[in-house]
C-alpha cells in the first residue's frame, strides 16, 4: 500500500516536472515569438513613420528631436551661429551629439543640399588632421576615404589648414580658428509605435 502511494507520488512529481518543463519551453517559445513580434512591430513602425515623415518633412513619430532633420539613421541640425571648429565640437557635445560625419555619397548629397547658401556660408564637418600634413580623421577616429570627396586645400588660409568645411557642395581644408556654422548629428532613436496612433475620427481625412 505504502509503496503504491509512494509510486503514485513519484508519478505525480514526474508529471509535474514534465508539465513544468513543457510550460518552461512554451514560455521560452512565447518569449522568442514576443521578441520577433516586437522586432517586426519596430520595423513596421519605422517604415510607416519614415513614409509619414517623407510626406511632410516632419511628423510626431520622428525619432529626432523637434527641429532636427531625420536622414538615414541619424538626426541632423544645421545651425546659423558661426564658431571655430573647436567651439562647434563642444557645442555639438553640449547638444548630446557630434560634428557632421559624411560616411557615404547619400550623406554628402544631403549635407550639400542642407548647407547650400547663396551667401557662401560654410559649415564645419567633423573631419580634421590631428597632426598637420598627416592623415585626415573623423572625430571618432575613423580614417577618411578619398573616394568620397576631394578636399581642396585652401591656400588663402594663413595658418595651418587642418579642419574641413563644406561650402556649396565643395569641401575645403581651413584654419580651425576660422568662424563657420556648426552641423551636429546624433544617432536617431527608436520610433515609438504608439506615436503612430491615429485617432479614429481623423481616418479618411485626405491621405
Amino acid at each position: 500500500q505504502y509503496y503504491q502511494l509512494s509510486n503514485t507520488g513519484q508519478d505525480t512529481i514526474s508529471q509535474m516536472e514534465e508539465r513544468l518543463g513543457n510550460t518552461s519551453q512554451e514560455l521560452q517559445s512565447l518569449q522568442v515569438q514576443n521578441i520577433k513580434l516586437a522586432g517586426s512591430l519596430q520595423h513596421v513602425a519605422e517604415k510607416l513613420c519614415r513614409e509619414l515623415y517623407n510626406k511632410a518633412g516632419a511628423h510626431r513619430c520622428s525619432p529626432c528631436t523637434e527641429q532636427w532633420k531625420w536622414h538615414g539613421d541619424n538626426c541632423y541640425q544645421f545651425y546659423k551661429d558661426s564658431k571655430s571648429w573647436e567651439d562647434c565640437k563642444y557645442f555639438c557635445l553640449s547638444e548630446n551629439s557630434t560634428m557632421l560625419k559624411i560616411n557615404k555619397q547619400e550623406d554628402l548629397e544631403f549635407a550639400a543640399s542642407q548647407s547650400y547658401s547663396e551667401f557662401f556660408y560654410s559649415y564645419w564637418t567633423g573631419l580634421l588632421r590631428p597632426d598637420s600634413g598627416k592623415a585626415w580623421l573623423w572625430m571618432d577616429g575613423t580614417p577618411f576615404t578619398s573616394e568620397l570627396f576631394h578636399i581642396i586645400i585652401d591656400v588663402t588660409s594663413p595658418r595651418s589648414r587642418d579642419c574641413v568645411a563644406i561650402l556649396n557642395g565643395m569641401i575645403f581644408s581651413k584654419d580651425c580658428k576660422e568662424l563657420k556654422r556648426c552641423v551636429c548629428e546624433r544617432r536617431a532613436g527608436m520610433v515609438k509605435p504608439e506615436s503612430l496612433h491615429v485617432p479614429p475620427e481623423t481616418l479618411g481625412e485626405g491621405d
Epitope: Y53, N54, G57, K69, W70, H71, Q105, E106, E109, F110, A112, S113, Q114, Y116, E118, E147, L148, F149, H150, I152, N168, G169, M170
Partner: antibody
Framework: QIQLVQSGSELKKPGASVKVSCKAS????????MNWVRQAPGQGLEWMGW????????TYADDFKGRFVFSLDTSVSTAYLQISSLKAEDTATYFC??????????WGQGTTVTVSS | DIQMTQSPSSLSASVGDRVTITCRAS??????LAWYQQKPGKAPKFLIY???TLASGVPSRFSGSGSGTDFTLTISSLQPEDFATYYC?????????FGQGTKLEIK
C-alpha cells in the same frame, strides 16, 4: 524606392505659358534640393538652376532668368517649373533632378514641351 | 563660367573594345567632375562623381580618372548596352555646365 515622376508632354502656342510638375517619392522631399535641366532636340544638357526645398529659394542660371519660375508644394512633395511667354526655342525636354547643385543621382523621366503655331 | 569640352564628339567601336572619352575644363575643377550616360528618349543615368567614384550599381568596366582640368572616362570592354551618349559635368560651384556629349556608336 526613390522616384521623380514628371507631368506629361505639352504642346503650346507661342506666347502661352506652361507648368511642368515633378513629384518626388521614396525620400524626404525637404532633405534634398531640386534642379531643372533642359535638353533641346538633338542637343546637350543645360543646367537651368535649382530650388532649395527647405527655404523655397530659387536660383537661376543666367540664360534662364526672367521667363522661368521654379516653385514648390512641399505638402505634396512636388516641384514645378513654369515658363511664360513661350518661344519656339523653348521646345525641349525638361528634366528635374534631385540634389544640391552638384551631381545628380536621380532624374525625372523628362517632360517634352513643344512650342508651335 | 567654366566651359567643359568633350572629345571626340562621336566615336565608333565594337563590342569588347576599350574606349576612352576625354573631358577638359576651362579652369581647374580639382576632382569635381561627374559623368552620365544617356540613351535616346531617356533621362541621363548617373555613372561617376568626384572624377573617379562609381555610383552604386554601375558596372566596374566603367572607370574615371583625372583632376584639375583633364579627365577621362574609360569603358574597359564595351558591352551592347553601353552604346549611348556620354556627358561630363563639373560640380565645382554654380553654374553647373555639361560637356557637349560624346556619341558612342556601334562600328
Amino acid at each position: 524606392q526613390i522616384q521623380l515622376v514628371q507631368s506629361g508632354s505639352e504642346l503650346k502656342k507661342p506666347g502661352a505659358s506652361v507648368k511642368v510638375s515633378c513629384k518626388a517619392s521614396g525620400y524626404t522631399f525637404t532633405n534634398f534640393g531640386m534642379n531643372w535641366v533642359r535638353q533641346a532636340p538633338g542637343q546637350g544638357l543645360e543646367w537651368m538652376g535649382w530650388i532649395n526645398t527647405n527655404t523655397g529659394e530659387p536660383t537661376y542660371a543666367d540664360d534662364f532668368k526672367g521667363r522661368f519660375v521654379f516653385s514648390l508644394d512641399t505638402s505634396v512633395s512636388t516641384a514645378y517649373l513654369q515658363i511664360s511667354s513661350l518661344k519656339a526655342e523653348d521646345t525641349a525636354t525638361y528634366f528635374c533632378a534631385r540634389g544640391a547643385p552638384a551631381w545628380f543621382t536621380y532624374w525625372g523621366q523628362g517632360t517634352t514641351v513643344t512650342v508651335s503655331s | 563660367d567654366i566651359q567643359m569640352t568633350q572629345s571626340p564628339s562621336s566615336l565608333s567601336a565594337s563590342v569588347g573594345d576599350r574606349v576612352t572619352i576625354t573631358c577638359r575644363a576651362s579652369e581647374s575643377i580639382y576632382s569635381y567632375l561627374a559623368w552620365y550616360q544617356q540613351k535616346p528618349g531617356k533621362a541621363p543615368k548617373f555613372l561617376i562623381y568626384n572624377a573617379k567614384t562609381l555610383a552604386s550599381g554601375v558596372p566596374s568596366r566603367f572607370s574615371g580618372s583625372g583632376s584639375g582640368t583633364d579627365f577621362t572616362l574609360t569603358i574597359s570592354s564595351l558591352q551592347p548596352e553601353d552604346f549611348a551618349t556620354y556627358y561630363c559635368q563639373h560640380h565645382f560651384g554654380t553654374p553647373l555646365t555639361f560637356g557637349q556629349g560624346t556619341k558612342l556608336e556601334i562600328k
